[in-house]
C-alpha cells in the first residue's frame, strides 16, 4: 500500500503502526520527540521499500537501531529534501547503528548524521555505493570510533564474511552492525542493481529486485512504476507523480492537496501531475488541469482590506512579494532603513498595476522610485481630494523617478503632485508628464517649480570617456575634462563602478538615502596641469568580469534660474580580461578495476574565462610498507601515527610530555596555530550548524493542534 | 486480509432494474479503480464496467452503455452497479474485481469477490 | 475494440508436463496483458501481469512472455491444482477485452 502525503510520527511510540501496511511512502517520513524510553522490538515494518522524499530522525529515546524497524529499506528517492539532505538523524541519544543493511541507494541529496552520542558502525558503511556523491555528507559529532571497535562480521573469528573497499585510501571491510555486511553488487552488474544472490537485476530497476533481468521484479524502480513494471518514461495518457510513478488524468484530478484544502486541485504539465503551475506557467482558466505560459511575470493579484497599503518598512512591502496587481491605493513613507532600495525591489519590484493612487511622502530613505521596476499602469479608480492619482511630497533625498528611456508607464485617470522634493529636477517630472499622458492635466500650482530641484544638479553637461585600457584585475579610463563656466566651481569627479553581468543597470539602482549603495565609489581629483585629462587606475577587479562605470563631476552650487549645473557620463561597460582559473574543485579517484582509476571533479568556483578543457596529469606512488608492519586484529595498542592536522590524544601527550618543533619529523608534536583560512572555515562550519538546527528546530516544533 | 463480497442478484423479468452492492474490505478502497466482469452460463469473462478511486471517470462496455451505471460510496467501502432495461442476454455471474495498482483505472484485477448471479427471465 | 484470440481452446496433459497457452491480440497492446486461472464455480485467479510479472503467492512454474501482439502463458511441471480454465486479458486500452479461455484437462 502506498501511504502519505508524509508520516509524522511524535511523541507517542505506538504511532509507529500507522506504517503497518506501507510497502511505499509517498513523501517524507519523520520519526521524532519521543523522550520516553520504549522497546522497540515489537515493532517491524518488513514491507516498507521506499521513501519518496526523505526520512528524519530526531531525539527517538530507547531507539537503538534502524534495522528491525525497517528492514527491507532500499531506496530514498529524495525527491523533496529536508535542508538539502535525505537521511537525517539527529540527536538520537541511544542509537547505536543505522543498521539499515538493506539501504541500496539514496538517488538525490546527501545526509546528516550529528550529534548522536552513542553512534558507531559509520565509519563500516561506503556511502558511495548508496549516493551519488558523498562530498556533502555532514558526519559530524556521533561517538567517536576509537571508541566504537566496529567489527564486521567474521572479523574475529578471522573469518571475514563482508567486502572491502576502499574509503579516504582506507581499504577495510563493509558492514551496517556486528551480523550484517554492507552488499555489494558485481562488477559486471555495473550500475545496476542486483538479486541477494548476485544476479544483475533489469536496468530499469533501481536498489534490489527479487528475479534477475526483469522489470516486474524489482524492489523500486530508478524512473517509473506504472501497473507492475518499471518504465522509462510514463505510457500514453498517465502522468509522472511525486518522481516515481505514473497516474491517469482522473488520479491527478482527484487529489486532495495536503497543503490547503481550499488549493484548485492538480495540474498536468509537461506530462507530470502536479500541485501547481512551475515558475513562468498558469492554469488556463480557474479550474482547468492546465497550464498556459504567462506572458512577462505570472500575474497576482493582491488586495488591501483597508483599501490603502501603507509601506513605511521592509516588513510591510514583504506582504507584498510576488504580487503583479495591487487592487487599493499605496502609500509608501519610509524614513529610514537598511538596505532599503534592494529590499523594496525584491518585495514590490513585480507590481505591474496599481488599481488606486500612488502616494510617496516623507520618504527621505528613498533616491529612486526604480524599486517599483514593474509598475506600467496607475488606473486611479480611487483618487486622493484634489483628484491626485500620483502624489509626491516632501522627500528630501529623491533624485529619480524612473528610468524613463526604458518605461512606459500610463496613469489612466487623476493628476499629479509634486512639491518639496529638493533634488528632484523639475525636467524629471515633465519627462513624467510626457510618458505617463498626463500632460495637459495638472494645474500650474501641481508641480512646483521652487521647491523641486532646488537642491540638485539638474542641468546636467556629457562627460565623455576618452580612453579605456583594462588588464585581468584592472581597468584604466581616462575622461574628457569638463569645463563648467567658471573654472573654479569644478571640484573633483566621483568615478562610480560596479560588476554588471548585463547592460541594463542605472545611476539608481540598489541605492538609498541610508548609506546603502550597490555602487563603489571612489573620488578622483583634478590633475593639476590643464591640459591631462582626468583618469582613474581601478585595481583590485575581478577577470573576465564585465563592469559598469559612470563618472560626475562635483561642482559647486551655480544659480543659474534657480537651478544647478553639472556633469555626468553615460554608464560605460567594459570586461576585465581573462586569468588562470581557480583549482578545480572536490577532486574524487576511485578505482573501478585493477587497471582503471576513475577521476571526477567539479568546475573551478572561478573560471577566471571560458573554460575550454581541464588537463588530468598521475603518477605511480610507491605502496605504502606501513599498512603491513602491525597486526591490526591483535589486542595491542595500534602505534601511534603523525596526524596530518598537527592533533593528538590526550592520553599521548601525558605519555610523551616533550614538545618538538611543529612539522618534526619524530613523534607527536605541537598543534600549530590555526592559520586565518582554518579559523574562517571553523566559524563558517559552526554558522552553517546554527543554521542547520534553526531549521530543522522551526520545520518541525508546530503549535500544538486546539 | 482483502476481501470483496457481491450482494443484491437475484431473478428479474426483461426490462427490469436491479442494485448490486460489493462491499470491500482489508485495504485502502478509495485508492484503488474498481470493476464488474461477468460470466454467462458455460461462457468464457466478459467485462462490464470500470469506476476509477475517485469516482470521477467511469467506463463501460459497449453492451451496456446507457443502461448501467457504475459508482461506488468511498465513505462505506462499497461499489453498485445499476442495472436497467435488463435483457436475457445480461444473465450471468457478476464477480466485483479490485484493481491491481493505485493510480490509474486500466490495469488487471488482483482481487475478486465470490460473485453473485443475475438471472432476466420472463 | 481489441480481440484477444487464445489457442488451443482446449489441451490436454498429464502431471509433470510442461503446457504452453498462447494468446494473440488483434492489434499490439505493448506488454499489457494478464493471465487468470479458473475453475468450476469459483472466481478468476490473477496470475501474470504485464505479460511476465508474477503475481505474488503464484507459484514460480507459472510464466509469461512475449509483447506486442503475441502472448505465451507456460506452465511447467503441471500440477494436480493447475488443471483449470485459463484467460488472457489486455488492459492497453478501454474497452478492457479477455481472451475466449483455454480448457486445461487431464491426459
Known amino acids: 500500500e502506498i501511504c502519505g502525503p508524509g508520516i509524522d510520527i511524535r511523541n507517542d511510540y505506538q504511532q509507529l503502526k500507522r506504517l503497518e501496511n506501507c510497502t511505499v511512502i509517498e513523501g517524507y517520513l519523520h520519526i521524532l520527540l519521543i523522550s520516553k524510553a520504549e522497546d522497540y522490538r515489537s515493532y517491524r515494518f518488513p514491507k516498507l521499500t521506499v521513501i519518496t522524499e526523505y526520512l528524519l530522525l530526531f531525539r527517538v529515546a530507547g531507539l537503538e537501531s534502524l534495522g528491525d524497524l525497517f528492514p527491507n529499506l532500499t531506496v530514498i528517492r529524495g525527491w523533496k529534501l529536508f535542508y538539502n539532505y535525505a537521511l537525517v538523524i539527529f540527536e538520537m541519544t541511544n542509537l547505536k547503528d543505522i543498521g539499515l543493511y538493506n539501504l541500496r541507494n539514496i538517488t538525490r541529496g546527501a545526509i546528516r548524521i550529528e550529534k548522536n552520542a552513542d553512534l558507531c558502525y559509520l565509519s563500516t558503511v561506503d556511502w558511495s555505493l548508496i549516493l551519488d556523491a558523498v562530498s556533502n555528507n555532514y558526519i559530524v559529532g556521533n561517538k567517536p570510533p576509537k571508541e566504537c571497535g566496529d567489527l564486521c562480521p567474521g572479523t574475529m573469528e578471522e573469518k571475514p564474511m563482508c567486502e572491502k573497499t576502499t574509503i579516504n585510501n582506507e581499504y577495510n571491510y563493509r558492514c551496517w552492525t556486528t551480523n550484517r555486511c554492507q552488499k555489494m553488487c558485481p562488477s559486471t552488474c555495473g550500475k545496476r542493481a542486483c538479486t541477494e544472490n548476485n544476479e544483475c537485476c533489469h536496468p530499469e530497476c533501481l536498489g534490489s529486485c527479487s528475479a534477475p533481468d526483469n522489470d516486474t521484479a524489482c524492489v523500486a524502480c530508478r524512473h517509473y512504476y506504472y501497473a507492475g513494471v518499471c518504465v522509462p518514461a510514463c505510457p500514453p495518457n498517465t502522468y509522472r507523480f511525486e518522481g516515481w510513478r505514473c497516474v491517469d488524468r482522473d488520479f491527478c484530478a482527484n487529489i486532495l492537496s495536503a497543503e490547503s484544502s481550499d488549493s484548485e486541485g492538480f495540474v498536468i504539465h509537461d506530462g507530470e501531475c502536479m500541485q501547481e503551475c512551475p515558475s513562468g506557467f498558469i492554469r488556463n482558466g480557474s479550474q482547468s488541469m492546465y497550464c498556459i505560459p504567462c506572458e512577462g511575470p505570472c500575474p497576482k493579484v493582491c488586495e488591501e482590506e483597508k483599501k490603502t497599503k501603507t509601506i513605511d518598512s521592509v516588513t510591510s512591502a514583504q506582504m507584498l512579494q510576488g504580487c503583479t496587481i495591487f487592487k487599493g491605493n499605496l502609500l509608501i513613507n519610509i524614513r529610514r532603513g537598511n538596505n532599503i532600495a534592494s529590499e523594496l525591489e525584491n518585495f514590490m519590484g513585480l507590481i505591474e498595476v496599481v488599481t488606486g493612487y500612488v502616494k510617496i511622502r516623507h520618504s527621505h530613505a528613498l533616491v529612486s522610485l526604480s524599486f517599483l521596476k514593474n509598475l506600467r499602469l496607475i488606473l486611479g479608480e480611487e483618487q486622493l481630494e484634489g483628484n491626485y492619482s500620483f502624489y509626491v511630497l516632501d522627500n528630501q533625498n529623491l533624485q529619480q523617478l524612473w528610468d524613463w528611456d526604458h518605461r512606459n508607464l500610463t496613469i489612466k485617470a487623476g493628476k499629479m503632485y509634486f512639491a518639496f522634493n529638493p533634488k528632484l529636477c523639475v525636467s524629471e517630472i515633465y519627462r513624467m508628464e510626457e510618458v505617463t499622458g498626463t500632460k495637459g492635466r495638472q494645474s500650474k500650482g501641481d508641480i512646483n517649480t521652487r521647491n523641486n530641484g532646488e537642491r540638485a544638479s539638474c542641468e546636467s553637461d556629457v562627460l565623455h570617456f576618452t580612453s579605456t585600457t583594462t588588464s585581468k584585475n584592472r581597468i584604466i579610463i581616462t575622461w574628457h575634462r569638463y569645463r563648467p563656466p567658471d573654472y573654479r566651481d569644478l571640484i573633483s569627479f566621483t568615478v562610480y563602478y560596479k560588476e554588471a553581468p548585463f547592460k541594463n543597470v542605472t545611476e539608481y539602482d540598489g541605492q538609498d538615502a541610508c548609506g546603502s549603495n550597490s555602487w563603489n565609489m571612489v573620488d578622483v581629483d583634478l590633475p593639476p596641469n590643464k591640459d591631462v585629462e582626468p583618469g582613474i587606475l581601478l585595481h583590485g577587479l575581478k577577470p573576465w568580469t564585465q563592469y559598469a562605470v559612470y563618472v560626475k563631476a562635483v561642482t559647486l552650487t551655480m544659480v543659474e534660474n534657480d537651478h544647478i549645473r553639472g556633469a555626468k557620463s553615460e554608464i560605460l561597460y567594459i570586461r576585465t580580461n581573462a586569468s588562470v582559473p581557480s583549482i578545480p574543485l572536490d577532486v574524487l579517484s576511485a578505482s573501478n578495476s585493477s587497471s582503471q582509476l576513475i577521476v571526477k571533479w567539479n568546475p573551478p568556483s572561478l573560471p577566471n574565462g571560458n573554460l575550454s578543457y581541464y588537463i588530468v596529469r598521475w603518477q605511480r606512488q610507491p605502496q605504502d610498507g606501513y599498512l603491513y608492519r602491525h597486526n591490526y586484529c591483535s589486542k595491542d595498542k595500534i602505534p601511534i601515527r603523525k596526524y596530518a592536522d598537527g592533533t593528538i590524544d590526550i592520553e599521548e601527550v601525558t605519555e610523551n610530555p616533550k614538545t618538538e618543533v611543529c612539522g618534526g619529523e619524530k613523534g607527536p608534536c605541537c598543534a600549530c596555530p590555526k592559520t586565518e583560512a582554518e579559523k574562517q572555515a571553523e566559524k563558517e562550519e559552526a554558522e552553517y550548524r546554527k543554521v542547520f538546527e534553526n531549521f530543522l528546530h522551526n520545520s518541525i516544533f508546530v503549535p500544538r493542534p486546539e | 486480509e482483502v476481501q470483496l463480497v457481491e450482494s443484491g442478484g437475484g431473478v428479474v423479468r426483461p426490462g427490469g432494474s436491479l442494485r448490486l452492492s460489493c462491499a470491500a474490505s482489508?485495504?485502502?478502497?478509495?485508492?484503488?479503480?474498481m470493476s464488474w466482469v461477468r460470466q454467462a452460463p458455460g461462457k468464457g469473462l466478459e467485462w462490464v464496467s470500470t469506476?476509477?478511486?475517485?469516482?470521477?471517470?467511469?467506463y463501460y462496455a459497449d453492451s451496456v452503455k446507457g443502461r448501467f451505471t457504475i459508482s461506488r460510496d468511498n465513505s462505506k467501502n462499497t461499489l453498485y452497479l445499476q442495472m436497467n432495461s435488463l435483457r436475457a442476454e445480461d444473465t450471468a455471474v457478476y464477480y466485483c474485481?479490485?484493481?491491481?495498482?493505485?493510480?490509474?483505472?486500466?490495469?488487471?484485477?488482483?482481487?475478486w469477490g465470490q460473485g453473485t448471479t443475475v438471472t432476466v427471465s420472463s | 475494440d481489441i480481440q484477444l484470440t487464445q489457442s488451443p481452446s482446449s489441451v490436454s496433459a498429464s502431471v509433470g508436463d510442461r503446457v504452453t497457452i498462447t494468446c494473440r491480440a488483434s492489434?499490439?497492446?505493448?506488454?499489457?496483458l494478464a493471465w487468470y486461472q479458473q475453475k468450476p464455480g469459483k472466481a478468476p485467479r490473477l496470475l501474470i501481469y504485464?505479460?511476465?510479472g508474477l503475481q505474488s503467492g503464484v507459484p514460480s512454474r507459472f510464466s509469461g512472455s512475449g509483447s506486442g501482439t503475441d502472448f505465451t502463458l507456460t506452465i511447467s511441471n503441471l500440477q494436480p491444482e493447475d488443471f483449470a480454465t485459463y484467460y488472457c486479458?489486455?488492459?492497453?486500452?478501454?474497452?478492457?477485452?479477455f481472451g475466449q479461455g483455454t480448457r486445461l484437462e487431464t491426459k
Open positions: 486479458q489486455q488492459a492497453s486500452s478501454f474497452p478492457i477485452t
Open positions: 504485464a505479460a511476465s
Open positions: 469506476i476509477s478511486g475517485s469516482g470521477g471517470s467511469t
Open positions: 492489434q499490439g497492446i505493448s506488454r499489457w
Open positions: 482489508g485495504f485502502t478502497f478509495s485508492s484503488y479503480a
Open positions: 474485481a479490485k484493481e491491481r495498482g493505485s493510480g490509474w483505472s486500466l490495469d488487471n484485477m488482483d482481487v
